[in-house]
């Protein structure tokens, strides 16, 4: 039968520079001599010769004269080979084919990498800076290998995901330099943090830059927003409340707002310099520009999803800057529930039957309540179970097994937490007359 | 080493248009903003306008608003001024200038001179 | 558009001679004020910004104060290299504005 070669499963991991082994066994018969083993190393998919070593002799290196044999273990089966200043060039398959009177072959994997450099940070501009303005942040890493990951992030940990442009560019040795661009506009001060990431390695090389602009000594502006969520029914228009004071003999060229998502920080409107700059929001929001010169700073938010929940930041500069957040909460009403009974006929007290309510399109989660027709709470063998949509939007379904009695109603309420609405549905049976002792 | 240099001087015909590059290097040119400032022999400065490359966002000084056209080329880093309908009081040193407050670094300029 | 005045419009004056130019605005412009120093055939050169703050590279005679409407330019002890013309600049509004310009001469 054919010779057992063994190699590692997994890729043999090497540093660019290092020498690397990569391992290969096979099992000597007993007067084993090495006169008789023809082994050869080659490249598993060019067929190109590594190393050899045939007639009991080590034929030596044709790889660059970077390879070696273990000559003391061959005799025991150790057909290893070493790869001395790996490059990222050898990466690949590299087979292991060994002949005595069978022979055998088997193949394993060289995986090459380099670490990442720490990141270097430059901000352009990186004076006179104010709220509003937008900054480029540039994160460059050097000499890695394979390609980085590159996450963005804030103070907070929160991942920025927005204008973010990566280029890698491999040298001629065939390592990667990575430069990572931010594009974020400032607000009153922000820590932004770059992770370069070697995903072979798991290697994190990471840095950051704090940022505070420029202060006036006049003081802050002081904005205002409610405190309670802004609740807003999907596919309806909500408007989220920002106001200022403006000061005597105050235009509307020296205001600087921007309306963004407290988390990502993604531009969600601005206006700067007088000018209304737009929705970068899905073309859904407009200021009120009539009303700004009086200090309203406030967001119309247009045919509201589910998608748009969570906080805006409503950010005012003028000499100084302010700013506040606002929660959108949003909410779709449950329909009247559908009920389903199974089995539905030929029903007998002491039949169990199952009772299916069914509400659809709503939102937040809802909670579900049985009850019998006396309002008894009924919770023992309920199962309810909500799927969201594409939407977000959820349909509940919601499941009560329950031993008929004589007859009975059941309620199912569908309470949407959120706008305090209850959609119920309820179901009747009559069992058939009661014949003693109960039929089999 | 951040440079701004721009193009040659040009004599142009009343009426016509000019049009003026200026060729960033040594930073990041969708960073900053570009401003265009003129100076007519012996005057002040006149600020034109600027262009936010990154995205070509103008803003334009009234008084040239109708004849001014700012642009960028981003794959070369370069911006460009064409003022039209020209007249001999456009005479003057035009400057490209990066920065949205302050303008940090300045081309060479380029002369324009307007004569029948 | 806010007008922006310069004074005086000329001057002369000797090597180590202190020297103070002042600008003027029509509105409040807080402290967005910056100075630029140009040499004939040359393009300005910023010096000030932010009212106060010195550019990078710019000896520290030169010094600027002021916030609102009144502002100053102050050369501690003038040197050769600093006979020029000064122009101040607004960053308040939109458009940009300078001053007439005031040109240092030497006695």
């Known amino acids: 039968g054919a010779l057992e070669v063994q190699v590692p499963e997994d890729p043999v991991v090497a540093l660019v520079g290092t020498d690397a082994t990569l391992c290969c066994s096979f099992s000597p018969e007993p007067g084993f001599s090495l006169a008789q083993l023809n082994l050869i190393w080659q490249l598993t998919d060019t067929k190109q010769l590594v190393h050899s070593f045939a007639e009991g002799q080590d034929q030596g290196s044709a790889y660059a004269n970077r390879t070696a044999l273990f000559p003391d273990l061959l005799a025991q089966g150790n057909a290893s080979l070493r790869l001395q200043r790996v490059r990222v060039a050898d990466e690949g398959s590299f087979t292991c084919f060994v002949s005595i009177r069978d022979f055998g072959s088997a193949a394993v994997s060289l995986q090459v990498a380099a670490p990442y450099s720490k990141p270097s940070m430059t901000l352009e501009p990186n004076k006179d800076l104010r709220p509003g303005d937008t900054v480029t942040i540039t994160c460059s890493s050097y000499q890695g290998y394979p390609e980085a990951e590159v996450f963005w992030q804030d103070g907070q940990g929160v991942p920025l995901t927005g204008n973010v442009t990566t280029s890698q560019m491999a040298n001629e040795q065939g390592l990667f330099d990575v430069h990572s661009i931010l594009r974020v506009v400032l607000g009153a001060n922000g820590t932004y943090s770059c992770l370069v990431r070697n995903p072979v390695l798991q290697q994190d090389a990471h840095s950051s830059v704090t940022i505070t602009p420029q202060r006036s000594p006049t003081g802050a502006v002081e904005v205002q927003v409610p405190e309670d969520p802004v609740v807003a029914l999907v596919g309806t228009d909500a408007t989220l409340r920002c106001s200022f004071s403006p000061e005597p003999g105050f235009s509307l060229a020296q205001l600087n707002l921007i309306w963004q998502l407290t988390d990502t920080k993604q531009l969600v409107h601005s206006f700067t310099e007088g000018r209304d700059q737009g929705s970068a929001y899905a073309n859904r929001t407009a200021l009120f520009p009539d009303l700004l010169a009086q200090g309203n700073a406030s967001l119309r938010l247009q045919r509201v999803r589910v998608a748009d929940e969570g906080s805006f930041t409503c950010f005012v500069s003028i000499r100084d800057f302010g700013s506040a957040a606002v929660s959108l909460q949003v909410a779709a009403p449950y329909s009247k529930p559908s009920m389903t009974l199974e089995p539905n006929k030929d029903l007998r007290p002491g039949d169990t039957v199952t009772i299916t309510c069914s509400s659809y399109r709503g939102y937040p989660e809802a909670e579900v309540f049985w009850q019998d027709g006396q309002g008894v709470p009924l919770t023992g063998n309920v199962t309810t179970s909500q799927m969201a949509n594409e939407q977000g939007l959820f349909d509940v379904h919601s499941v009560l097994r329950v031993v008929l009695g004589a007859n009975g109603t059941y309620s199912c309420l569908v309470r949407n937490p959120v706008l305090q609405q209850d959609a119920h549905g309820s179901v009747t049976i009559t069992g058939q007359p009661m014949t003693f002792p109960p039929e089999a | 080493e951040v440079q701004l240099v721009q193009s040659g001087a040009e004599v142009k015909k009343p009426g016509s248009s000019v049009k003026v590059s200026c060729k960033a290097s040594g930073y990041t040119f969708t960073a900053y903003w570009m401003n265009w400032v003129r100076q007519a022999p012996g005057q002040g400065l006149e600020w034109i306008g600027r262009i936010e490359p990154y995205d070509s966002e103008t803003r334009y000084n009234q008084n040239f608003r109708d004849r001014a056209t700012l642009t960028v080329d981003k794959s070369t880093s370069t911006a460009y001024m064409e003022l039209s309908s020209l007249r001999s009081e456009d005479t003057a040193v035009y400057y490209c200038?990066?920065?949205?407050?302050?303008?940090?670094?300045w081309g060479q300029g380029t002369t324009v001179t307007v004569s029948s | 558009d806010i007008q922006m005045t310069q004074s005086p419009s000329s001057l002369s004056a000797s090597v180590g001679d202190r020297v103070t130019i002042r600008c003027r605005t029509s509105?409040?412009?807080?402290?967005?004020l910056a100075w630029y120093q140009q040499k004939p055939g040359k393009s300005p050169k910023l010096l000030i910004y932010n009212a106060n703050t010195l550019e990078e590279g710019v000896p520290s005679r030169f010094r600027g104060s002021g916030s609102g409407t009144d502002f100053t330019l102050t050369i501690s002890s003038l040197q050769p290299e600093d006979f020029a013309t000064y122009f101040c600049k607004q960053a308040y509004d939109v458009p940009r504005t300078f001053g007439g310009g005031t040109k240092v001469e030497i006695k």
């Open positions: 509105e409040n412009i807080d402290y967005t």
């Open positions: 200038a990066r920065g949205v407050r302050i303008f940090d670094y």
